[in-house]
Amino acid sequence: KIDACKRGDVTVKPSHVILLGSTVNITCSLKPRQGCFHYSRRNKLILYKFDRRINFHHGHSLNSQVTGLPLGTTLFVCKLACINSDEIQICGAEIFVGVAPEQPQNLSCIQKGEQGTVACTWERGRDTHLYTEYTLQLSGPKNLTWQKQCKDIYCDYLDFGINLTPESPESNFTAKVTAVNSLGSSSSLPSTFTFLDIVRPLPPWDIRIKFQKASVSRCTLYWRDEGLVLLNRLRYRPSNSRLWNMVNVTKAKGRHDLLDLKPFTEYEFQISSKLHLYKGSWSDWSESLRAQTPEEEPTGMLDVWYMKRHIDYSRQQISLFWKNLSVSEARGKILHYQVTLQELTGGKAMTQNITGHTSWTTVIPRTGNWAVAVSAANSKGSSLPTRINIMNLCEAGLLAPRQVSANSEGMDNILVTWQPPRKDPSAVQEYVVEWRELHPGGDTQVPLNWLRSRPYNVSALISENIKSYICYEIRVYALSGDQGGCSSILGNSKHKAPLSGPHINAITEEKGSILISWNSIPVQEQMGCLLHYRIYWKERDSNSQPQLCEIPYRVSQNSHPINSLQPRVTYVLWMTALTAAGESSHGNEREFCLQGKAN
């Protein structure tokens, strides 16, 4: 009921707590002398379900049979309405609709660690919508029993606060949980277990790793465990990997040797414990230990390539390039590269350590036979040196690969294809495909890229350091012993019409013809490989179509003669550039009048 009501009563039969689907009878009755003033037959009693009128009756009492109430609490309020006055509340009552508890399922108990306490969990089943109390009972040997009650509404966990000890690890204990509410009760099936069944060891702690003589091949993992632990599981992985390596060990006594770790690799290690071969459960995984394995001397050999450049009659510039070893080959932090340059006949050698770069340039005489050796060094030693004899890579014309082509292959890839050289193709030991951004000045600072291809391949997909709308000079070398032949081509992965035309910077007259000079289009405006330049001209005030001359693009060419202009006529000239995608806009316009005599 709401409270002790002065004006009347609301009673509920059979009970104010009912099973879902039940019917209730609600009676509202006025106390003596609490009706409408003067004339009691004018009493109008109204029954509300919350704010909805469900029944009314004139007189001292009202009866109502109510069905179909929802789960939860429903409030009924009885009001009195008299003529010419507001309704007044007489009394009210709540009806609680719920269900009896279902049988708790999947009761399971656990003790975390040898010093922990027994705690059990279960599944409650469907919501009762009523206050439901859970009682957990544990019985053990010698008629010992423990009991714990749960006052929480959604109770599915209780800790007994008692500790099972290993004195008699095979002794049986039985747990049972009982749910009780106003509509009934239900008990779980009993769960029977021993100490070994329910004790879940604490995860191992104080994990550390030692490398004897700073060697990855002599590695021991140490940890601490609870006293009764019999089994351990170890898992470890490189920090950048998602896959674990797993090892099961018995009676490890807090140590285990690991034999398959890679050098100079950060690993994550975790350990779990168990008390018995087939009883009980594994502990949680320990906190991770992260540790880096020691370095080992590098394996593998550097991929080395070179470029020669003629300086003058007696000197040449050699530029050496090499690629970083892979992490698995470097096996440590590369501290420096050792480059040895040797003249093979005279035996003179010079050695240099290079740090922070993967290239080296030097000037050597054009005479003599030269060789280089390059190796990588970490704190533990050096890789085997890569030896290369310096030769004229393009000297053997018969070794030059034929029909070299370069075609765009999707985003930022170029497919380079070729035919074997005319000379016995079986003489080719390997192909090297080299590419670098095309710079009109032939800038030697432009990074060089290369890849090696087996002698039976006649194509290579280049994708490293390839940018859209940039033209690359691509060379294919065929190497055979101390000889090499090469062919070159220009290629791009993506192209469009150039953003601007060449800028004419000078027009000069020479013996009745003119020489036009221009500035190259900036590389970032070329938008791919240029195929042609066009020079346009027309008489200054004429509306006629301009004439044009198309010149194949050559990197170093920046001028061209025209000899079809009439003397003493003023012409307007301009230039455009073309890629395979189309023609640029006009460059600047220049006027010119040829002074020479008419023919």
Epitope: D3, G72, T73, L75, F96, H129, L130, Y131, K151
Partner: nanobody, 115 residues
């Protein structure tokens, strides 16, 4: 055991607004309705509004359209936002949680509406 503590009452002019709060201790309140009642001097305690455990609101005719009941189960708190207050709303406002074991009431908070 559930304890209820109301707050937010005070003196306000007719037409003004107040927001009452009632905070419960004991998580069982989340499965029950939470109600607001009021008692004016010399009158009986009367029901004002209820909100079910799933958040459905109900109002007495005198409160409908002016008052709004809401609840925050995480904070175990029920609120009554009262707008367009009238002098006849002057009363002590009580928070109540009905359970099948009995009703839990707060101590009440005084609301006075002056004309």
């Amino acid at each position: 055991q559930v304890q209820l503590q109301e707050s937010g009452g005070g003196l306000v002019q007719a037409g003004g607004s107040l927001r009452l709060s009632c905070t419960a201790s004991g998580s069982i309140v989340s499965i029950y309705n939470m109600d607001w009642y009021r008692q004016a001097p010399g009158n009986e305690r009367e029901w004002v509004a209820s909100i079910t455990s799933s958040g459905d609101p109900y109002y007495d005719g005198s409160a409908k359209g002016r008052f709004t009941i809401s609840r925050d189960n995480a904070k175990m708190t029920v609120y009554l936002q009262m707008n367009s207050l009238k002098p006849e709303d002057t009363a002590v406002y009580y928070c109540k949680v009905p359970t099948e074991k009995g009703n839990y009431w707060g101590q009440g908070t005084q609301v006075t509406v002056s004309s």
